[in-house]
């Protein structure tokens, strides 16, 4: 394989490394209150936390990035914590013809990794 | 659509926003000199730069993240610049039976977005 094994234990202490966290947001927060009717409030799972060397590396590229960041921190950024997968969410919204239910596949994170 | 249109012009000035940049790396830099034979040096395209509000948003989730970061910067991180696609690269490496050519699909970034 082109890469060392990604680490899954956080060397920075509990809750500091890349993980999924729930953020409460209203339609007003999202600027959606003019077209989304429901839900009024969303429990949004988001990816937060740091990406220390080789922690939850998304792929070979992320591992290279981590290594080069160690060598050239001013030139190469550290990997960062982003969604690895998403959970579909259904929104009820206004349409020209009335009200519609629509599924959005890329709205709520289900898992995170360092990319 | 669940989201505003992502921005493609950088409000921070030229070269400051999320973009593809070439980084030169040797096999020694990558720690691969013991098993990769060729190329001796790699031109690695990596994603660097900032992700200001709605710049090159990867998807709806990234746009929500940008918006909530504006409202709760301590709780929600800004989107960050990561690969949207990769370019395959062929490496020549040692194997138990000799030398092999192998394609790696996730080694060099081809495009970037804010996730």
């Amino acid at each position: 394989s082109a890469h060392a094994h990604p680490r899954d234990s956080c060397p920075l202490g509990p809750g500091r490394c890349c993980h999924l966290e729930t953020v409460q947001a209203t339609l007003e927060d999202l600027g959606w209150s003019d077209w989304v009717l429901s839900p009024r409030q969303l429990q949004l799972s988001m990816c937060v936390g740091e990406c220390p060397h080789l922690y939850r590396s998304a792929n070979t590229h992320a591992q290279i990035k981590a290594r080069l960041h160690g060598l050239q921190p001013d030139k190469v950024p550290a990997p960062c914590c982003v969604p690895s997968s998403y959970t579909p969410v259904v929104l009820m919204h206004r349409t020209d013809s009335g009200v519609s239910l629509q599924t959005y596949d890329d709205l709520v994170a289900r898992g995170c990794h360092c990319a | 659509s669940a989201h505003a249109h992502p921005r493609d012009s950088c409000p921070l000035g030229p070269g400051r926003c999320c973009h593809l940049e070439t980084v030169q790396a040797t096999l020694e830099d990558l720690g691969w000199s013991d098993w990769v034979l060729s190329p001796r040096q790699l031109q690695l395209s990596m994603c660097v730069g900032e992700c200001p509000h709605l710049y090159r948003s990867a998807n709806t989730h990234a746009q929500i993240k940008a918006r909530l970061h504006g409202l709760q910067p301590d709780k929600v991180p800004a989107p960050c610049c990561v690969p949207s696609s990769y370019t395959p690269v062929v490496l020549m490496h040692r194997t138990d039976s000799g030398v092999s050519l192998q394609t790696y699909d996730d080694l060099v970034a081809r495009g970037c977005h804010c996730a």
């Epitope: 009717l37 429901s38 839900p39 009024r40 409030q41 969303l42 429990q43 949004l44 799972s45 959970t87 579909p88 969410v89 259904v90 009820m92 206004r94 009200v99 519609s100 239910l101 629509q102 599924t103 709520v108 | -």
Partner: antibody
Amino acid sequence: QVQLVQSGAEVKKPGASVKVSCKASGYTFTNEGISWVRQAPGQGLEWMGWISAYTADTFYAQKLQGRVTMTTDTSTSTAYMELRSLRSDDTAVYYCARTRHDTSGLRFDYWGQGTLVTVSS
Amino acid sequence: DIQMTQSPSSVSASVGDRVTITCRASQGIDSWLAWYQQKPGKAPKLLIYAASSLQSGVPSRFSGSGSGTDFTLTISSLQPEDFATYYCQQVHSFPITFGGGTKVEIK
């Protein structure tokens, strides 16, 4: 605890109208929608439509369009369903149901006890 | 409109039996499916939502599975209070539609 209490049974003549009420308690009324479902004797469940208790936007089932009106009174946390031009095949038990909606989707998590509407000449 | 087809329409079973009810959607509905139990003269009661999430207060012998077009409600060990009619419901798109129901009867 969440409760939905509906108005009592009604007997109506064909061509008349009926208005069924559904009083909610135990939660913030405007946070969730209300759906109406009916069940003819010995039959299955038929969804009639939905109303947002927050915006009063509605969606009505096609077959009832033009005959049904759903409304809410947020001051009393009450939802209403009016059905006009009643026919004998409108004879059914009418239920209101809180329509919970979050990132796990929609579901009817609390129901009223039902209101029997009999249409007979 | 999305049609929901339940099978069987009725099933005879004994206390302690494992009972499986299936529900098929006429088009893909992701995991946007709920299951309800109804006893004679009573309002329906929510058992399962989002295809497999157990509603609070519902016994763990009830479970749901499936996604897309094919779904299953399983009662792992039938209890006397489980004899009732069960309905599936799609909440993927308007109009919301119910299956025709499955009556679980005492053998």
